[in-house]
Interface confidence: medium
């Protein structure tokens, strides 16, 4: 139903905690560069407002939309164009236009020095004194490092930093605490990011059908008694959320997010047997929790997929007639015998199902010919189960860290004219597959390699469309989104490449490396673990463990010298020429 | 629970016409694929006509084409098979069917589906 103040029904539906929670996240995704406390006063300045449009639904300009309310906040910062540049520029135009700018400026990798989590004594203290400006330095810190992390999730993750707090603050050793409670939040919203960033990549990139494809193959895994009207009904919901989210609405979403909870709550009875648990959790959880809820059992007698969508002789006149009610329905019903497949795999079934049908429906006997599509289906599976096999094996043998630098081997052999912080990032993301995906029953481990291989996948496509430097990533990343894991396994050394000139600067290290925590260091090895590749992309497995082991014992050994400096110095030029020999 | 209940057979000579009604309770007959099966004496029971739900796709076995038309009536939660020139061949038991979640008839195979009326008769005879 229409509202005479939009915001005004904002508010009323998410209260003001929220409201306030979002209204910073939508700020900081937008402007990346302001300070905390630019932002919060423009939260503060917009809630005042909703709240005199909640008082009176006709007061002046409260029949505006939020994209122009907030739009008007933003473009009213002084210095703007000093800060931001062009994007001052999407100030003269008018919404939707304007909104549109907005989103195009989005930057995915913000110049910005990483999130530094404070001493546990100092955290406390800061969170003790004022629990809100420290939740919402979290919220901004966030989502100005991730301009598309999910609104409503982001709260949830706030809600979990403070749990976290609340609890380990108390404690005598609060580090103790703290330390792996907040570890495993931040990588869960690490892997969160990343997803979403996928799922706006699919809305920008192929639009609605696609993501509204993907919905439906998810949900049918999950609710597989649920039926296909049900499925439809909740892939159309999500699709508007995501759209809503992906495209800044942020009050939209969450709100219409929450509805959906709703609804899922109250009608459990037509589409899952494990809801309940979720049911009885208050809003935000509660969302959080549906999300990521267990599949339901398979109904025990679903007949064979070939009956309907090969033996019967209305497949071209479905085909022909309802060509996405036919394809959603193959989707829904694949899809729901299969939760061990992953949501790529799966689209990639129903694509080739819909170009079999295409050929097959247009030839003299279509039965005849679409009659072998599932046996045509065999190579599609077999190629992910062999990734997830071969990797799996690898890391159970090299352990998080080898298993990282194998990757990232592979994949400087693959783009090599990527900038090596991009390929370091992606190849230690891409490594940690191993930790999330590889200990899983067997039947969990496909999905979860490669919906996680395909959304890090995404992270690199997006950071290389804003600097591409290899015609390789492009023509990965350009193709549909469910044929980059593969496009990407399928690549090979580049021969095109011309190897880096050595440069000894590159690998010359001094005191400071001792000093830092152990992930900082491993980055310090597989930067240099990546020009060494960059210099000789064709050099052997032995060849790059030898250096990379001289240089471990290296480091090892000088950080262990009495005279740290003078160790670096002396025995770091030893090292560059005993590394340019072995590579020779 | 989805109930249907069929009415409208009875003895028919040849050549003439019928309207046989399915009323459906318990579900919306237009979000779903329903059909129409007959089951003569000592034989299995055949598809005739079918209709898609939330899809206006009409699905016709060839005995019947040109000769049955299959309709329904949201309003009245309600599936229809208007029949014309029938024939002493035409003569059996009409049950009407549904596969829940099923927007298209993509089988026609009576094992399909799950939730049948009790039937009524249809005799042509002169």
């Known amino acids: 139903e229409a509202h005479k103040s939009e915001i005004a029904h904002r508010f009323k539906d998410l209260g003001e905690q929220h409201f306030k929670g979002l209204v910073l996240i939508a700020f900081s995704q937008y402007l990346q560069k302001c300070p905390y406390e630019e932002h919060i006063k423009l939260v503060q300045e917009v809630t005042d407002f909703a709240k005199t449009c909640v008082a009176d639904e006709n007061a002046e300009n409260c029949d505006k939309s939020i994209h122009t309310l907030f739009g008007d906040k933003l473009c009213a910062i002084p210095k703007l164009r000093d800060n931001y540049g062009e994007l001052a520029d999407c100030c003269a135009k008018q919404e939707p236009e304007r909104n549109e700018c907005f989103l195009q400026h989005k930057d995915d990798n913000p110049n910005l020095p990483p999130f530094q989590r404070p001493e546990a004594e100092a955290m406390c203290t800061s969170f003790q004194e004022n629990p809100t400006s420290f939740l919402g330095h979290y919220l901004h810190e966030v989502a100005r490092r991730h301009p598309y992390f999910y609104a409503p999730e982001l709260l949830y993750y706030a809600e979990k930093y403070n749990e976290v707090l609340t609890q380990c603050c108390t404690e005598s050793d609060k580090a103790a605490c703290l330390t792996p409670k907040l570890d495993a939040v931040k990588e869960k919203a690490l892997v969160a990011a990343v997803r979403q960033r996928m799922k706006c990549s699919s809305m920008q990139r192929f639009g609605e059908r696609a993501f509204k494809a993907w919905a439906v193959a998810r949900m049918s895994q999950r609710f597989p008694n649920a039926e296909f009207a049900e499925i439809t009904k909740l892939a159309t919901d999500v699709t508007k959320i995501n759209k809503e989210c992906c495209h800044g609405d942020l009050l939209e979403c969450a709100d219409d997010r929450a509805e959906l909870a709703k609804y899922m709550c109250e009608n459990q009875a037509t589409i899952s047997s494990k809801l309940q648990a979720c049911c009885d959790k208050p809003v935000l959880q509660k969302s959080q929790c549906l999300a990521e809820i267990e599949h339901d059992n398979i109904p025990a007698d679903l007949p064979s997929i070939a009956a309907d969508f090969v033996e019967d002789k209305e497949v071209c006149k479905n085909y022909a007639e309802a060509k996405d009610v036919f394809l959603g329905t193959f989707l829904y019903e694949y899809s729901r015998r299969h939760p061990d497949y992953s949501v790529s795999l799966l689209l990639r079934l129903a694509k080739k199902y819909e170009a079999t049908l295409e050929k097959c429906c247009a030839e003299g006997d279509p039965p005849a010919c679409y009659g072998t599509v599932l046996a045509e289906f065999q190579p599609l599976v077999e190629e992910p189960k062999n990734l997830v096999k071969t990797n799996c094996e690898l890391y159970e043998k090299l352990g998080e860290y080898g298993f990282q630098n194998a990757v990232l081997v592979r994949y400087t052999q693959k783009a090599p004219q990527v900038s090596t912080p991009t390929l370091v990032e992606a190849a230690r993301n891409l490594g940690r597959v191993g930790t999330k995906c590889c200990t899983l029953p067997e039947a969990q481990r496909l999905p979860c390699v490669e919906d996680y291989l395909s959304a890090i996948l995404n992270r690199l496509c997006v950071l290389h469309e804003k600097t591409p430097v290899s015609e390789k990533v492009t023509k990965c990343c350009s193709g549909s989104l469910v044929e980059r894991r593969p496009c990407f396994s399928a690549l090979t050394v580049d021969e095109t490449y011309v190897p880096k000139e050595f440069k000894a600067e590159t690998f010359t290290f001094h005191s400071d490396i001792c000093t830092l925590p152990d992930k900082e260091k491993q980055i310090k090895k597989q930067t240099a673990l990546a020009e060494l590749v960059k210099h000789k992309p064709k050099a052997t497995e032995d060849q790059l463990k030898t250096v990379m082991g001289d240089f471990a014992q290296f480091v090892d050994k000088c950080c262990k010298a009495a005279d740290k400096d003078n160790c670096f110095a002396t025995e770091g030029p030893n090292l560059v020429a005993r590394s340019k020999e072995a590579l020779a | 629970e989805v109930q249907l209940l069929e009415s409208g057979g009875g003895l028919v000579q040849p050549g003439g016409s019928l309207r046989l009604s399915c009323a459906a309770s318990?579900?919306?007959?237009?979000?779903?694929?329903v059909a129409w099966f007959r089951q003569a004496p000592g034989k299995g029971r055949e598809f005739v006509a079918g209709?898609?739900?939330?899809?206006?796709?009409?699905y016709y076995a060839d005995s019947v084409k040109g000769r049955f038309t299959i309709s329904r009536d949201n309003s009245k939660n309600t599936l229809y098979l208007q029949m014309n020139s029938l024939r002493p061949e035409d003569t059996a038991v009409y049950y009407c069917?549904?596969?829940?979640?099923?927007?298209?008839?993509?089988?026609?195979?009576?094992?399909?589906?799950?939730?049948w009326g009790q039937g009524t008769l249809v005799t042509v005879s002169s």
């Open positions: 318990g579900r919306y007959i237009d979000e779903t694929a």
């Open positions: 209709i898609g739900g939330g899809v206006d796709i009409t």
């Open positions: 069917g549904t596969r829940p979640g099923r927007p298209l008839i993509t089988s026609k195979v009576a094992d399909l589906y799950p939730y």
